[in-house]
Interface confidence: low
Amino acid sequence: SCNTATCVTHRLAGLLSRSGGVVKDNFVPTNVGSEAF
């Protein structure tokens, strides 16, 4: 099973499937993870 933080945070947040969006650095995050390096 997936053991990286990406998968853990996505499972918790229900974000395995997401759409793109424009974000700003001071935006309050819903999760943090390693979707990409």
């Epitope: 990286t4 990406t6 998968c7 969006g21 424009v22 943090v32 979707e35």
Partner: antibody
Framework: EVQLVESGGGLVQPGGSLRLSCAAS????????ISWVRQAPGKGLEWVAE??????????HYAEAVKGRFTISRDNAKNSLYLQMNSLRAEDTAVYYC?????????????WGQGTLVTVSS | EIVLTQSPATLSLSPGERATLSCKAS??????VSWYQQKPGQAPRLLIY???NRYLGIPARFSGSGSGTDFTLTISSLEPEDFAVYYC?????????FGQGTKLEIK
């Protein structure tokens, strides 16, 4: 402007040590997960180590090839990332990049530095 | 360790043509695959994450697809600046791994 600037590379003899630094600016450094990724001359990319954000206790993970020899750390007050490299080998010769990422749930942000060259040779 | 195998190793095409790059994982990685572009002397640039999500600022001609073990990066109509090396990577399991790269060259 977002910037990641690596430094500390150079020529070192086999068995020697080197400490790489990555200075970040233009974003909230403490929120970001950061990896060191390396690229041997003329070769592909290889992940080296990862350190999580401050809120995730700055937990670390390493590639088997460097485990026990390399240590990744961060100083959020200085917006800096480090890679302490000990017992260096010829196969550690590479350009070392720091790469940061932040997952907002709706999108991610991903920044890379331009790299610093480490040459391990006698 | 999850091995990513990219094909072809080299792809020779002309501007305006469609490019299809493949990445196959040795184990199931759901959709935790990213694609990077790298030009000589430059750092990698993220194109696609989560198998199919285009990164901010990436032109619409780049698209990603796939899940499980088979993934594809498609460039619908090649521009001169697209000729570079492309890498896939996975963040499903530690250690994170990269494919060996596909060199996209001008025919």
């Amino acid at each position: 402007e977002v910037q990641l600037v690596e430094s500390g590379g150079g020529l070192v003899q086999p068995g020697g040590s080197l400490r790489l630094s990555c200075a970040a600016s233009g974003f909230t450094f403490s929120n970001y997960w950061i990896s060191w990724v390396r690229q041997a001359p003329g070769k592909g990319l290889e992940w080296v180590a990862e350190i999580r954000s401050e809120s995730d206790a700055s937990a670390t993970h390493y590639a088997e090839a460097v485990k026990g020899r390399f240590t990744i750390s961060r100083d959020n007050a200085k917006n800096s990332l480090y890679l302490q490299m000990n017992s260096l080998r010829a196969e550690d010769t590479a350009v070392y990049y720091c790469a940061s990422y932040f997952d907002y749930g709706l999108a991610i942000q991903n920044y890379w530095g331009q790299g610093t060259l480490v040459t391990v040779s006698s | 360790e999850i091995v990513l195998t990219q094909s072809p190793a080299t792809l020779s095409l002309s501007p305006g043509e469609r490019a299809t790059l493949s990445c196959k994982a040795s184990k199931r990685v759901t959709t935790y695959v990213s694609w990077y572009q790298q030009k000589p002397g430059q750092a990698p640039r993220l194109l696609i994450y989560g198998a199919s999500n285009r990164y901010l600022g990436i032109p619409a001609r780049f698209s990603g697809s796939g899940s499980g073990t088979d993934f594809t990066l498609t460039i619908s109509s090649l521009e001169p600046e697209d000729f570079a090396v492309y890498y896939c990577s996975q963040s499903y399991n530690y250690p994170y791994t990269f494919g060996q790269g596909t060199k996209l060259e001008i025919k």
